[in-house]
């Protein structure tokens, strides 16, 4: 992410190296880890970002109750296999030939198996629930102000179409952001809710993926919104397939 010619940098992804060697001699930015060219006018796919991260030197309530099929990313970081478009391949394997199936946000949705494990398709995560707890404040935030600020954030910072922010719930100190995006709704050029959620997660953790921008400074009517805990639930278009042993554990 350093080449100087014509400000050859990637504003939306600092985990890149840019060089004026693209088509027509234009600036081209390659994701670390994979070397795949990325479109710096939009968010980079989560798969390429995870791969880059792994290659980097070693770094009557209104609240929604997640459904029984909701997945939480308990497995943490891994070095994923991405397809030619930068999406997660349906089957992921580690160096010891342990394999598992993932959804479109790269979260495991089956028990782990061996190389014979089949993952017929990449199952789409169509509903993401971002569950936040904010630090204590003098008083509760105004719900409509909070709603407007978070919608603005997803629209302006992450370029996510407003129709994909389904709802913002608030019960002090818990905030929930619901993102919904079915396969049929996602048009060419639309930011994926999984990518937007990942950028948001990294922002909240103070690990912004944006080049040269300051960290996330969330304010509601001038009052800082500081998050102290984040949980993200992923709901797939097809429920995950785990053995009963895991479900009862």
């Amino acid at each position: 992410h350093t080449a100087a010619q014509d400000n050859c940098t990637c504003p939306t992804n600092k985990m890149t190296v840019c060089s004026p060697d693209g088509p027509g001699g234009r600036c081209q930015c390659r994701a670390l880890g994979s070397g795949m060219a990325v479109d710096c006018s939009t968010l980079t796919s989560k798969c390429l970002l995870l791969k880059a991260r792994m290659s980097a030197p070693k770094n009557a309530r209104t609240l929604v109750r997640p459904s029984e099929h909701a997945l939480v990313d308990n497995d943490g970081l891994y070095d994923p296999d991405c397809d030619p478009e930068g999406r997660f391949k349906a089957r992921q394997c580690n160096q010891t030939s342990v394999c598992w199936c993932v959804n479109s946000v790269g979260v495991r949705r089956t028990d782990k198996g061996d190389l014979s494990l089949r993952c017929d398709e990449l199952v789409r995560t169509h509903h993401i629930l971002i569950d936040l707890r904010h630090r204590p404040t003098a008083g509760a935030f105004n719900h409509s102000d909070l709603d407007a600020e978070l919608r603005r954030l997803f629209r302006e910072r992450y370029r996510l179409h407003p129709k994909f922010v389904a709802a913002v719930h608030y019960e002090q100190p818990t905030i929930q952001i619901e993102l919904r995006q079915n396969t049929s709704q996602k048009a060419a050029g639309d930011v994926d809710i999984g990518d937007a959620a990942y950028y948001f997660e990294r922002d909240i953790k103070g690990e912004s993926l944006f080049q040269g921008r300051g960290g996330l400074d969330l304010r509601v009517r001038g009052e800082p919104l500081q998050v102290e805990r984040t949980l993200i639930y992923y709901l797939d278009e097809i429920p995950p397939k785990f053995s009963m042993k895991r479900l009862t554990a």
């Epitope: 350093t2 100087a4 050859c8 190296v17 060089s19 004026p20 088509p23 070397g35």
Partner: antibody, heavy 115, light 107 residues
Framework: QVQLQQSGAELVRPGTSVKMSCKAA????????IDWVKQRPGHGLEWIGN????????NYNEKFKGKATLTADTSSSTAYMQLSSLTSEDSAIYYC????????WGQGTTLTVSS | DILLTQSPAILSVSPGERVSFSCRAS??????IHWYQQRTNGSPRLLIK???ESISGIPSRFSGSGSGTDFTLSINSVESEDIADYYC?????????FGGGTKLEIK
């Protein structure tokens, strides 16, 4: 004009190491990748890896991890490749090229590993 | 890794003929393919970049086409100086890979 000048031929013993150089001129060294390619006599071209001098990022073909080490000195616009634990299989011509499109190539360094 | 398969291994043509070299990728790589010529005892030379972009100083008889997985390098009127090995290379993702090459011979 852009030029990549490689160091001269090397004759070395098995088990030793060698470090070859690639001096760039005619462009901003820190703006482009330098890639290294191996060619054994009668064989095709094999990508070893690359280095981005602007940030010292490196990538290696899995086959050459532990064999090749890529470095760069921005003050002299020179890229280096060290090959270790040499065997006869390492005897080849080694090229440096400006990447990611290899639009300029060095003249090659011939490495002969022989006892 | 992306596998590039070049065919045929050897092409034998008469001067003035049109010749085409094929390069097939094991997965879609857009237009991230480049073509090189290597004469005997010489370094490779870039002929075409990004599947079809011409290179300054390369004769106009060289052209390229294709996208996705199938790519072609063409010489519309072969000259004796074109005797060489021809390689395709992908820069879609690391590790970069080369095709096995096609040797052009003149009848």
């Amino acid at each position: 004009q852009v030029q990549l000048q490689q160091s001269g031929a090397e004759l070395v013993r098995p088990g030793t190491s060698v470090k070859m150089s690639c001096k760039a001129a005619g462009y901003t060294f820190t703006n482009y990748w330098i890639d290294w390619v191996k060619q054994r006599p009668g064989h095709g071209l094999e990508w070893i890896g690359n280095i981005f001098p602007g940030g010292f990022y490196t990538n290696y073909n899995e086959k050459f991890k532990g064999k090749a080490t890529l470095t760069a000195d921005t003050s002299s616009s020179t890229a280096y490749m060290q090959l270790s634990s040499l065997t006869s299989e390492d005897s080849a011509i080694y090229y440096c090229a400006r990447g990611g499109v290899f639009d300029y190539w060095g003249q090659g360094t011939t490495l002969t590993v022989s006892s | 890794d992306i596998l590039l398969t070049q065919s045929p291994a050897i092409l034998s043509v008469s001067p003035g003929e049109r010749v085409s070299f094929s390069c097939r990728a094991s997965q879609s790589i857009g237009t991230s393919i480049h073509w090189y010529q290597q004469r005997t005892n010489g370094s490779p030379r870039l002929l075409i970049k990004y599947a079809s972009e011409s290179i300054s100083g390369i004769p106009s008889r060289f052209s390229g086409s294709g996208s996705g997985t199938d790519f072609t390098l063409s010489i519309n009127s072969v000259e004796s100086e074109d005797i060489a090995d021809y390689y395709c290379q992908q820069s879609n993702s690391w590790p970069y890979t080369f095709g096995g090459g096609t040797k052009l011979e003149i009848k």
